[in-house]
Structure formats: structure tokens, C-alpha cells
């Protein structure tokens, strides 16, 4: 996240962090029921584990961190590496998750957003561009809904209705290693940080998320085929 | 280096179990997932299963019930147990490592295990 | 089931002839798709992963591409050391899986 701040401890009790071992994280991912979450097709790999109520990004132990193995992960069929268009995955937990103030699943969105819908985008990515260098702990930013035309304009011909275009001034954006995490919008997931320009924050350049209004009926089926 | 090996019985008896094991040198078991294959005499590659650092496991719908395959991350191997054996299990047997974007990278030399009386 | 058809099953060509193998998913597998050259006496050698990418040290005449149910493995100009078999393999789900591997498709000198 670029020019972000420090999220309130507490707040993102559904934020998840996807990691290689040891412990090095590479997206962030959402919890939306009990045992799944959902994150970028992009960010699939064989072997991660999952992190769950954690506030920084060092291993360090905190209290109220949960600790999960990935058993399924199962990408939209409509995803295309290396594109962008249907860039979502659910993950399905070995185990159900212990619900507390730190762990908690959140509600996909059913509506589609509109332009200047205030949202808010979390993750432990880059908190600078071209240059690397990740956050303490978990960054938030506020952010905000572009038309699809804005959106269609920032990016000729790479957009379409599975994604949405959502920024702020020129210098703040969701970056490397925030991809797959949450854009929660009027306290419902909307989005997942997907793709954009490089380096970012660019002017006119906004990120580009996975519009999850448009897969609330993939989600619910593939979660009650495989639980 | 970054090496398979596998071993075991060249030949089994049929309705016998087949064991095989994989040495792992080079790279550690617990950040790869392995899968082990087979390839009967002439034909194409069959998948049997694989198995996750985690101790996750998935198998071929056909190797269900039939296969076990199991790992000890200390001594760095695979084990891989096919029981009741018919001549139709005789093949060359893979064990492989998966890059973790799901393609088979690193692949042992094979040992053939006939299955004959 | 996620069945994986590939065609030809063999197909004879020359040295530097462009060569195209595909391969087919019963269902959509994204892009979740590997091949592999398998010589006769050794093991399969991973050539592309996720459809397109290529394996560290396969030589750039050989490129994948497709997405969903349909992929192509392209040699673009045939090297004497190409003649051998190739296979593809889905990675989109271990869910009931017969097996992942295609049938193959053997390369031989025209």
C-alpha cells in the first residue's frame, strides 16, 4: 500500500496473508465463511500457508493469530495467466476457524459499486514503487471508486466487467504483495487488489480490483460443492 | 545438487504390495509438494498422487484404497505403497517435485518393478 | 472429469519444420497446464508451465500458449534433439482425477 497508514488493530479480522515458507508472504487473501477464503487466481502457488489475525508482518507471535493449511484452491475457470479478467481463487482451510475479534469472516458484496463509492483497501505490500519496502505492519487506504469509464481510459482495451478502477490522488494505490487482499466497500467485500501500473501510484493510473459483484453465484456453488 | 532417487524391488509377486521410496537431496521436503507417476511398458504417463508438506494428500481416483504415500521430512524421503498388485501395475515408476506453479521439475530416474509370479 | 486429449498422437516432421501439438481439457483448466519431452529410457523434462511460461534451460523455440480448454505446445523450427514424446498435464484440480497427464504425442523423422 503507497501512502497508506497504519490500520486500527482490530479492524481487518478477515484480512488473511498468504505465505511461502518460511515466512515470507506474497498476497493477501480475504476470509468469507468459516473455512474459505478468497484471494487473486493470480497469487496460486502448491504449497503456502495461511495466516489469519495477525497485525504485523514478522512472524512474530501475537495472541490472536490463527495458523491454516490451503487443501483446495480452486482459481475461476475463466482466468487466463498471464491476464487479468476473472482474477479470483477460493481456498478452502483444513480447518474451520475459531471466530474471534481477530478472526472474522466477511460478507460478499451482491452489489455492483458505483463511481465515488468510498472504500478501503488493506495489505502488507510494497509501501514504496519502484523501490521495495514492506510495512511493520498491516497498511490501510482509503480509496475510491472510478467510473468504468475513467477506468476503460486509464487502460484501452484491457478492461472488462469482472474488474473495477478505484484510486485517489496520484501517490496512493495498493502494490506488489497487496494482491488478493480486501477492498471493502459500506462494510462489504468488493473487491480483491488485482493488477495495475508499474511502479504505482502513478497519475491516472488507478488499481484495478476483481469485481466480486460479479461471482457472488460462483462462490456460493463452489463453496457448497466442496464443503 | 537437486536430486530423486527411487528405490525398491524390481519385481513383485501379484496380489503382493509394491513399496518404493524416493531419497530427496538438495532441497528441503517441506516447501514442495512431490508426486509420484508411473509409466507401464509402450504407454503414456499415469498420475498416482501426491503428497503435500503439510501431510495432505490426493490420489488417483483409480489408486484409492490401493496406494499409500506417505514422507518423512527428517530423513528426506517419499514412500510410495501400491497393494494388491496385478500385472497391469508393472511400470516405471516416477516420484517428481512440483515447482509450486504446478509443473513437475525435478523427476527421479524411474525404477522399473515388474509384477510376475 | 478433467480429461486431457492430445492430438496427433504421433506425427512425422523435418529438421526445422515448425511443429504444433494440442491439447484439450474436457472442462476449463484456466491456465493451469504443464508439458514435458520424455526421450525413450528417460525421465519426463518440464518444458512450460501456466500454459506460456517456459522452465528454466528449455530452449526459446519451444512456446506455449491457451487458456480454458484449449492449449498448443509450438516448436518453432525442429531440432534433431526434439525428436521424442511430449505430454501435457492439467493442474487446475486433483478432485477425482483419473489422471492429469494427456495420452502423449510422439515426434518422430519424417
Known amino acids: 500500500i503507497i501512502n497508506g497508514s497504519d490500520c486500527d488493530m482490530h479492524t481487518q479480522p478477515w484480512q488473511a496473508a498468504l505465505l511461502l515458507r518460511p515466512n515470507q508472504l506474497y498476497c493477501g487473501a480475504v476470509l468469507v465463511h468459516p473455512q474459505w477464503l478468497l484471494t487473486a487466481a493470480h497469487c496460486r502457488k502448491k504449497v503456502f500457508r495461511v495466516r489469519l489475525g495477525h497485525y504485523s508482518l514478522s512472524p512474530v507471535y501475537e495472541s490472536g493469530q490463527q495458523m491454516f493449511q490451503g487443501v483446495k484452491s480452486i482459481p475461476h475457470p475463466g482466468y487466463s495467466h498471464p491476464g487479468h479478467s476473472n482474477d479470483l481463487m477460493l481456498i478452502k482451510l483444513n480447518r474451520r476457524i475459531r471466530p474471534t475479534k481477530d478472526v472474522r469472516p466477511i460478507n460478499v458484496s451482491s452489489h455492483c459499486p458505483s463511481a465515488g463509492t468510498k472504500c478501503l483497501v488493506s495489505g502488507w505490500g510494497t509501501t514504496k514503487s519502484p523501490q521495495v519496502h514492506f510495512p511493520k505492519v498491516l497498511q490501510c487506504l482509503n480509496i475510491s471508486v472510478l467510473s468504468q469509464k475513467r477506468c476503460e481510459d486509464a487502460y484501452p482495451r484491457q478492461i472488462d466487467d469482472t474488474m473495477f478502477c478505484a484510486g485517489d490522488k496520484a501517490g496512493r494505490d495498493s502494490c506488489q504483495g497487496d494482491s488478493g487482499g480486501p477492498v471493502v466497500c459500506n462494510g462489504s467485500l468488493q473487491g480483491l487488489v488485482s493488477w495495475g501500473d508499474y511502479p504505482c501510484a502513478r497519475p491516472n493510473r488507478p488499481g484495478v480490483y476483481t469485481n466480486l459483484c460479479k461471482f457472488t453465484k460462483w462462490i456460493q456453488e463452489t463453496i457448497q460443492a466442496n464443503s | 545438487e537437486v536430486q530423486l532417487q527411487e528405490s525398491g524391488p524390481g519385481l513383485v509377486k501379484p496380489s503382493g504390495t509394491l513399496s518404493l521410496t524416493c531419497a530427496v537431496s538438495?532441497?528441503?521436503?517441506?516447501?514442495?509438494?512431490m508426486s509420484w507417476v508411473r509409466q507401464p511398458p509402450g504407454k503414456g504417463l499415469e498420475w498416482i498422487g501426491d503428497?503435500?508438506?503439510?501431510?495432505?494428500?490426493d490420489y488417483a481416483s483409480w489408486a484409492k484404497g490401493r496406494v499409500t504415500i506417505s514422507q518423512d521430512k527428517s530423513k528426506t524421503q517419499v514412500s510410495l505403497k501400491l497393494s494388491s498388485v496385478t500385472a497391469a501395475d508393472t511400470a516405471v515408476y516416477y516420484c517428481?517435485?512440483?515447482?509450486?506453479?504446478?509443473?513437475?521439475?525435478?523427476w527421479g530416474q524411474g525404477t522399473l518393478v515388474t509384477v510376475s509370479s | 472429469a478433467y480429461d486431457m486429449t492430445q492430438s496427433p498422437s504421433s506425427l512425422s516432421a523435418s529438421v526445422g519444420d515448425r511443429v504444433t501439438i494440442t491439447c484439450q481439457a474436457s472442462?476449463?483448466?484456466?491456465?493451469?497446464l504443464a508439458w514435458y519431452q520424455q526421450k525413450p529410457g528417460k525421465a519426463p523434462k518440464l518444458l512450460i508451465y501456466?500454459?506460456?511460461t517456459l522452465a528454466s534451460g528449455v530452449p526459446s523455440r519451444f512456446s506455449g500458449s491457451g487458456s480454458g480448454t484449449d492449449f498448443t505446445l509450438t516448436i518453432s523450427s525442429l531440432q534433431p534433439e526434439d525428436f521424442a514424446t511430449y505430454y501435457c498435464?492439467?493442474?487446475?484440480?486433483?478432485?477425482?482425477?483419473?489422471?492429469?497427464f494427456g495420452g502423449g504425442t510422439k515426434v518422430e523423422i519424417k
Open positions: 517428481a517435485r512440483d515447482n509450486n506453479d504446478y509443473g513437475l521439475d525435478i
Open positions: 538438495g532441497f528441503p521436503l517441506s516447501n514442495y509438494a
Open positions: 503428497i503435500y508438506p503439510s501431510d495432505i494428500i
Open positions: 472442462q476449463s483448466i484456466s491456465s493451469w
Open positions: 501456466l500454459a506460456s
Open positions: 498435464q492439467q493442474g487446475y484440480t486433483n478432485s477425482n482425477i483419473i489422471n492429469t
